[in-house]
Amino acid sequence: EAHKSEIAHRYNDLGEQHFKGLVLIAFSQYLQKCSYDEHAKLVQEVTDFAKTCVADESAANCDKSLHTLFGDKLCAIPNLRENYGELADCCTKQEPERNECFLQHKDDNPSLPPFERPEAEAMCTSFKENPTTFMGHYLHEVARRHPYFYAPELLYYAEQYNEILTQCCAEADKESCLTPKLDGVKEKALVSSVRQRMKCSSMQKFGERAFKAWAVARLSQTFPNADFAEITKLATDLTKVNKECCHGDLLECADDRAELAKYMCENQATISSKLQTCCDKPLLKKAHCLSEVEHDTMPADLPAIAADFVEDQEVCKNYAEAKDVFLGTFLYEYSRRHPDYSVSLLLRLAKKYEATLEKCCAEANPPACYGTVLAEFQPLVEEPKNLVKTNCDLYEKLGEYGFQNAILVRYTQKAPQVSTPTLVEAARNLGRVGTKCCTLPEDQRLPCVEDYLSAILNRVCLLHEKTPVSEHVTKCCSGSLVERRPCFSALTVDETYVPKEFKAETFTFHSDICTLPEKEKQIKKQTALAELVKHKPKATAEQLKTVMDDFAQFLDTCCKAADKDTCFSTEGPNLVTRCKDALA
């Protein structure tokens, strides 16, 4: 229904706390360089204005759209052009073009320092002093580094953060209580970020229809007892929620997500038997829980998929009468039977089925033509299954760090022109798939591996889009989202690449490496590994292992030496010489 004042409506629906959090996230995602204090001031002004509209919806400007109100606030920031360059040009436009312009200027890789966690004592002190400001800082710092983070989900992670601090700051050993718990939240939040970015990419590049197909497959796997009409309704609502969040309409997004959670909990009987636990929780936890609820038990009496989609004489007639509905039904029926497949795979199968019908229904004898379509799915199913087996075997053999290194070598060979920091980040993220998925039961591995890899590769594509350097990467990133992962997997050594010349300084290290945390040490070593491959793209695994073992030994020796600096300056050049010889 239409409301006289949109801002008053959202403030009333969401409540002050969530309203302020979402406005802060919105501003931080649009203007990623502004300080917390600058944004906090704007948030307070917007909140005060919302309250005047709640008191009197007819008050001046209360009838304006949220984009107009927020955009006007952002455009009033002093020194906008100095700090943001051409983003300031957005302010010369009218809505809705102005908001589109802001969206286009979101930076997926802002040049901000890594979000450093203060030490436990300091963190607890500032949390106790002012919990609201502390959490505001958290929202601001995450949102500006992840401009497409799913806003209502970020509120959930902030709530988790709050609960952990409340609990751990009361303990004697704050550090050992906080570290593992906050690391867990950070890991989950980072995965959530890349997953949501993938959804927004799908929406931006291929439109609502593509996202809705993704949603139908995912929901059908999770709720195999819901009928097609129910799944379609949920997919339509979920598409609206994601479209709003991806489009920067965070208040509407959070409000509609709450409505969807409410609907699901009120209609458990027609959706799933597994929702009750989630539905007993408060709002943020409830919506989060529903988004990752376990799959319902599949109905026992499902007929073979061939009955309606291959053997039925009416296939082409049904397809002609309502293409999208018929293909949607196919996707629903196939997905509810295969919780063990990835959504990407299910969408590839649906695409194959559609292509088969397009070709066969135009023939004189369609059934003879499409009769073998299910058999033609086999290679499409085998490919990701083999990928999972090969990679999980390798992970089990090498462990996470070794597995990351194997991926780093592989991807540097595929796309040696890509910057080393991007390759290292990608390989480290891709390598985490082992820890995340390979330990799961067999039937959960494939969906976990492939959908996670697809999300990480989407980030690779986004970063590469900014500065395209590799034809291989451009080729894989230009196709449809569901074909990306198979495309990257199929890439081989880039034969067009001219190897980088050997620069001794790239492989020269100093004693400061010894005091770095383990993660930073790994990144330094992985940076060297990528540079080695760029120097010798056709080096064998054996050669690279020899060099890396030598390198690890060198670090170990010098970091234990009494005079570290002397060790690094005398042994370093010897290491460089040995590396050159080993790779010659």
Partner: nanobody, 115 residues
Framework: DVQLVESGGGVVQPGNSLRLSCAAS????????MSWVRQAPGKGLEWVSS????????LYADSVKGRFTISRDNAKTTLYLQMNSLRPEDTATYYC????????SGQGTLVTVSS
């Protein structure tokens, strides 16, 4: 909405000819193969003939081979069945269908062959 409207039926003597038409709308006509099926009084549906979307491929039931010709005009989104040398056993209601469908979409057109 998909619509198939058959016309051209009538009463003819054995050995004579008739041309049936089927006007199609509500779908991408060129993307679909089309068929003619028929139903004799008190009998089940019987496939008669099919044609590919482009019109380049045609198939016929043995019982009509050499006597019937299926064709289409994609510009007019119309399917045809030219029936020559008609026999009493060709008496039936004729329906046009999409793809390999053996169902009645339109109201059909009645062909009666009798002396």
């Amino acid at each position: 909405d998909v619509q198939l409207v058959e016309s051209g039926g009538g009463v003819v003597q054995p050995g004579n000819s008739l041309r049936l038409s089927c006007a199609a709308s509500g779908f991408t006509f060129t993307s679909f193969g089309m068929s003619w099926v028929r139903q004799a009084p008190g009998k089940g549906l019987e496939w008669v003939s099919s044609i590919s979307g482009s019109g380049s491929d045609t198939l016929y039931a043995d019982s009509v081979k050499g006597r019937f010709t299926i064709s289409r005009d994609n510009a007019k989104t119309t399917l045809y069945l030219q029936m020559n040398s008609l026999r009493p056993e060709d008496t039936a209601t004729y329906y046009c269908t999409i793809g390999g469908s053996l169902s009645r979409s339109g109201q059909g057109t009645l062909v009666t062959v009798s002396s």
